[in-house]
């Protein structure tokens, strides 16, 4: 062991640049710090074979496999991958260690496998083996967290059955409404599964892993708050756990809380109470109603009553499978060029949806906001006044929903013209869709007022890229107009635009654009 060189194998991850092939070099890229791969002499091997930890990377990731050799004198090397030899250029670092690198750019299935590095130094020969595979992310899942009571303790456990195992955090807020937004200073995050402080105003549990982040809010009725105009509604699927928290504050301890389902008291074992004194010596009581696995007959009005507060209710609806309720009829909008406007979709869904807004094959993040009436809303304002088709797509574990929107921007036509030997064509994408006139310019009509009606053909076509309509008009060439200047004009309620074309022989035409408002 003592006469062998000290070998260090590392993996360097790169933030991807657009490239595609493996290179045996030091390639300029933004890199993370090297990760040790625990290179060690492979047991029972014939010859000196070092092996690095098995490497597993995402598709399209870029990495460098690197070996640092602490051995005196020069080294020569050769990479072998799938029986092909790859060029190898060792260099020396500041500590005079030999450095050999293999860059794999944009990892693909064909680049997975065993990479062998043969090194020859003045003292000895040895081989280093790297095994590189593609991570199977198809097995990854991220499930919405749910609550369980901790055995023998007044505490809630947050559970998310996800792969890879998620980081679970409680997100707590003690103020009302807008100030409980995720990044607000009023929000406190606790990265732990068990929560003992259950008296806060707003309690959520979130789970995050490589697939993203999912959260569940602890459904709460606050008897000190004015009830919502519409009855709060909670949806659950058969088999899911039900948790409702009833909270009340009073000047002293002389009050009690009870839960009823459809006017019948909840059975023992389906509720538990906690109480504490707040800073101003008032008493806070909370009473949890819970069912570890709901059935259809757990549907109904759950009412929390207090001897000192008006009672409040929530409607719990148990469904067999999830749903997304919204109107899917397509909607058309026309707006002015600088008018502020947002698309919006109002929906009721359970479980919570994942959604995207799409325009011209590009997806945009989708935000949803809960409304007081049990509905949610998603708005999209980032259209940058580009006309065309916008698509809202939503899905949850059980349902999918798609809604189409068309956005038209009111504007004066802009005319483009082209001509061939047999015809002249003009195009415009103004809105409302323009009407067309063709005029002939001649000695008799130097101002081009002589209208052409023969041989004109108008049509509207969908420009596929944005889903926006383009109107065109084509004039078939006749002997009567050959050699003359003609003018095509597009007009709508916002103005007129014209283009003048010289009709002579095929080839590039000089176009003169007239803008007439």
């Amino acid at each position: 062991n003592q006469d062998l060189p000290v070998i260090k194998c590392v993996l360097i991850n790169h933030k991807n640049n657009d490239s595609s092939v493996g290179k045996s070099s030091s390639y300029p890229m933004v890199s993370e710090s090297p990760e040790d791969l625990g290179c060690a002499l492979r047991p029972q091997s014939s010859g000196t074979v070092y092996e690095a930890a098995a490497v597993e990377v995402d598709v399209s990731a870029s990495i460098t496999l690197q070996v640092l050799v602490d051995a005196p004198g020069n080294i020569s090397c050769l990479w072998v991958f799938k029986h092909s030899s790859l060029n190898c250029q060792p260099h020396f670092d500041l500590q005079n260690r030999g450095v050999v690198s293999m860059v794999i750019l944009k990892m693909t299935e064909t680049q997975a496998g065993e990479y062998l590095l043969f090194i020859q130094s003045e003292a000895t020969n040895y081989t280093i083996l790297f095994t590189v595979s593609i991570r199977n992310t198809l097995l990854y899942t991220l499930r919405r967290p749910y609550f369980r009571k901790m055995e023998n303790q007044d505490a809630l456990v947050c559970i998310s059955e996800s792969v890879p195992e998620p980081i679970v955090e409680w997100v707590l807020c003690d103020s009302q409404g807008e100030s409980c937004k995720e990044e607000s200073p009023a929000v406190v995050k606790k990265e732990e599964k068990v929560l003992h402080e259950l008296f806060g105003t707003d309690i959520r549990c979130c789970a995050r892993n490589e697939l993203g982040r999912e959260c569940t809010r602890l459904f709460t009725i606050d008897l000190n708050q004015t009830p919502q105009t519409t009855l709060p509604q909670l949806f659950l699927k058969v088999g899911e756990p039900l948790w409702i928290r009833c909270k009340a504050v009073h000047v002293n301890h002389g009050f009690g809380l009870t839960w009823e389902l459809e006017n019948k008291a909840l059975e023992e074992g389906n509720y538990f109470e906690m109480s504490t004194y707040s800073t101003n010596r008032t008493m806070i009581r909370i009473l949890f109603a819970f069912v570890s696995s709901v059935a259809r007959n757990d549907t109904g009005y759950y009412t929390c009553s207090s001897s000192k507060h008006p009672s409040q209710s929530a409607l719990v609806t148990i469904v067999e499978k999830g749903f997304i309720n919204a109107t899917n009829s397509s909607e058309d909008y026309e707006i002015d060029q600088y008018e502020e406007f947002c698309f919006s979709v109002r929906f009721k869904a359970y479980p919570q949806i994942r959604c995207t807004w799409t325009f011209s094959r590009k997806s945009f993040p989708c935000e949803q906001k809960g409304l007081d009436n049990g509905y949610s809303i998603s708005k999209f304002c980032n259209h940058k006044h580009q006309p065309g088709e916008y698509i809202f797509h939503a899905e949850n574990d059980d349902a999918q929903f798609t809604k189409m929107f068309t956005l038209n921007i009111r504007r004066k036509p802009q005319v483009l013209a082209e001509a061939s030997a047999s015809q002249a064509s003009c195009f415009s994408d103004g809105y409302p869709l323009p009407s067309w006139t063709w005029k002939k310019c001649s000695d008799k009509s130097p101002n081009c007022t002589e209208e052409i009606t023969e041989g004109v053909w108008n049509r509207k076509a969908n420009r596929k890229v944005f889903g926006q309509w383009v109107s065109s008009s084509t004039l078939n060439m006749s002997e009567a107009i050959k050699g003359f200047l003609v003018k095509c004009c597009a007009y709508n309620s916002l103005g007129t635009s014209c283009e003048t074309i010289l009709l002579n022989s095929p080839g590039p035409f000089p176009f003169i654009q007239d803008n007439i408002s």
């Epitope: 993996l11 991850n13 990760e35 040790d36 791969l37 625990g38 060690a40 492979r42 047991p43 029972q44 092996e51 690095a52 930890a53 098995a54 490497v55 597993e56 990377v57 990495i63 065993e114 083996l129 790297f130 095994t131 792969v163 890879p164 195992e165």
Partner: antibody
């Protein structure tokens, strides 16, 4: 340079839950077949393996302590957390975290690097 | 669980002399892939353990060649050809064939 460092309370009361964090550097639990184990050693006694977690999220626990242990990782923070419920004076020990490496050809270098250990005393 | 039994419990050796520690497992540590999942560690006073030998007979990086391991199946031996003062401490064997991983009770080596 591979390093591991254990952190957590030095004193825990009986029945309480112990949470220990192993913060490591020089390697990661994301792209290589690596793992982190927790091992403890009561004063003057032998080593006892508690739990391990691998980069692919595979976990194992000591048979006798399984019901009390939970191991988890935060790849981005380069941390592995061990929680042990219902602590008892017999759990007084130095708790170590150590790295293990898995190789493509099916062998393992177990515990090639260790933390310095953190002494946890369980007493009322 | 696999039980690991180490003998002797302690060993007092003259510097330059050889030393041998035995480790027996309650079941074979030979995996179907041909590897024996047996490891040796040395814990010097006041330090965490350090890996000496992996997969029965492979010296870990930086471990002097006076340390050697041998054996197969259920019987394994760690030998120190010439004990030096820096070799004092407790030696542990460990199996990793299956979880839970288990350690031997340790052998304390001291210098005469």
């Amino acid at each position: 340079q591979v390093t591991l460092k254990e952190s957590g309370p030095a004193l825990v009361k009986p029945t309480q839950t112990l949470t220990l964090t192993c913060t490591f550097s020089g390697f990661s639990l994301s792209n290589a077949r690596m793992g982190v184990s927790w091992i403890r050693q009561p004063p003057g006694k032998a080593l006892e393996w508690l739990a391990h977690i691998f980069s692919n999220d595979e976990k194992s626990y000591s048979t006798s302590l399984k019901s009390r242990l939970t191991i988890s990782k935060d790849t981005s923070k380069r941390q592995v957390v061990l929680t042990m419920t219902n602590m008892d004076p017999v759990d007084t020990a130095t708790y170590y975290c150590a790295r293990m490496v898995g190789y493509g050809s099916g062998w393992y270098a177990y515990f090639d690097y260790w933390g310095q250990g953190t002494l946890v005393t369980v007493s009322s | 669980d696999i039980v690991m039994t180490q003998t002797p419990l302690s060993l007092s050796v003259t510097p330059g002399q050889p030393a041998s520690i035995s480790c027996r497992s309650s079941q074979s540590l030979l995996h179907s892939n041909g590897y024996n999942y047996l490891y040796w560690y040395l814990q010097k006073p006041g330090q965490p353990p350090q890996l000496l030998i992996y997969e029965v007979s492979n010296r870990f990086s930086g471990v002097p060649d006076r340390f050697s391991g041998s054996g197969s199946g259920t019987d394994f031996t760690l030998k120190i050809s010439r004990v030096e003062a820096e070799d004092v401490g407790v030696y542990y064997c460990m199996q990793a064939l299956q979880t839970p991983l288990t350690f031997g009770g340790g052998t304390k080596v001291e210098i005469k």
